[in-house]
């Protein structure tokens, strides 16, 4: 039975040209995290593999930095970066846990962070 929950940074906003940290945290399970995927809609941005470390997709290498921790830093944000991001935790023995973050990239200087929320 899967007992874990993923806590994410929820709905967040950031300024065009700036940076943002996407963060997820898996709790309430003793399962071993074997790999964390960061995905945007139908694209793979980066992977942190327990054995192989971080790998960034070639098309995002210039704008994506690993960390902090299992999180992901997006840099030089554009309005096209607005959308859903997913952290996918592959764990053993539990299986897969998925967290969702919605990022809005704003033209203006008004960018506020949303509240945290949980996905069971």
């Amino acid at each position: 039975m899967m007992t874990g929950t993923i806590e994410t940074t929820g709905n967040i906003s950031a300024e065009k040209g700036g940076s943002i940290i996407l963060q997820c945290h898996l709790s309430s399970t003793t399962a071993q995290v074997t790999q964390v995927n960061w995905e945007q809609q139908d694209q793979l941005l980066a992977i942190c593999n327990a054995d192989l470390g971080w790998h960034i997709s070639p098309s995002f290498k210039d704008r994506v930095a690993p960390g902090p921790g299992l999180g992901l830093t997006l840099q030089s944000l554009t309005v096209n970066d607005t959308g859903e991001y997913f952290c996918i935790y592959h764990t053993y023995p539990d299986g897969t846990y998925t967290g969702r973050i919605f990022l809005e990239v704003l033209e203006s200087s008004v960018a506020e962070h949303g509240a945290r929320f949980q996905i069971p």
Epitope: H90, Y92, G95
Partner: antibody, heavy 122, light 110 residues
């Protein structure tokens, strides 16, 4: 449309080698691992190994280590398996299969090639 | 010899439900949720029906369901139809030994 297209049937002599190809299309090739699964006539499925182009990581089942080489050509979106020192028991249909999830976790396969029959006979 | 034990054959009449079992050990099926089921018609490639014990790919009918109890995983097919006649294979995945398949079960629709 996501698909895996495999090379044609082969007839080989015992002791020789065979190389089967699997060309992927319709998705971002490097993001998904591809495994090779074989099926001898009238028998069950047997996982041989797989490759994750994203990491360029290759895993081979213990039974086939030393006899199997799996490679990927990202310029043509093609994965290859080469099996050496062939014997009659290697006669089988060889399938390539794509991982269900990105990143090469390899626990389930959602897209399969149509299979390549390799016959080993003297 | 496969590490996962399946019955050689099962059968059922149209409209009935059938269950196919897949028995492993406390080291594989009993210890994790990475159990998948595949359907294979004669001369065709396998098709993924269930993954992670009980999850169905979006295109698979909800007549197919998966479950697990102890060291045994099960595939249940309800409202049996003629086109369900096929071979069914379970598989178990562990990061160390990768994927192992069961020997397969032939389902006959009477």
């Amino acid at each position: 449309e996501v698909q895996l297209v495999q090379s044609g049937a082969e007839v080989k002599k015992p002791g020789s080698s065979v190389k089967v190809s699997c060309k992927a299309s319709g998705y971002t090739f490097a993001s998904y691992g591809i495994s090779w699964v074989r099926q001898a006539p009238g028998q069950g499925l047997e996982w041989m190994g797989g490759i994750t182009p994203f990491f360029n990581r290759v895993d081979v089942a213990e039974k086939f280590q030393g006899r199997v080489t799996i490679t990927a050509d990202t310029s043509t979106n093609t994965v290859y398996i080469e099996l050496s020192s062939l014997r009659s028991e290697d006669t089988a249909v060889y399938y390539c299969a794509r991982d269900l999830r990105r990143g090469g976790v390899g626990d389930a396969f959602d897209i399969w090639g149509r299979g390549t029959l390799v016959t080993v006979s003297s | 010899q496969s590490a996962l034990t399946q019955p050689r054959s099962v059968s059922g009449s149209p409209g009935q439900s059938v269950t196919i079992s897949c028995t492993g050990t406390s080291s594989d099926v009993g210890s994790h949720n990475y159990v998948s089921w595949y359907q294979q018609h004669p001369g065709k490639a396998p098709k993924l029906m269930i993954y992670e014990v009980s999850y169905r790919p979006s295109e698979i009918s909800n007549r197919f369901s998966g479950s697990k109890s102890g060291n045994t995983a099960s595939l249940t097919i309800s409202g049996l139809q003629a086109e369900d006649e096929a071979d069914y294979y379970c598989s178990s995945y562990t990061p160390s030994s990768a994927t192992v398949f069961g020997a397969g079960t032939k389902l006959t629709v009477l």
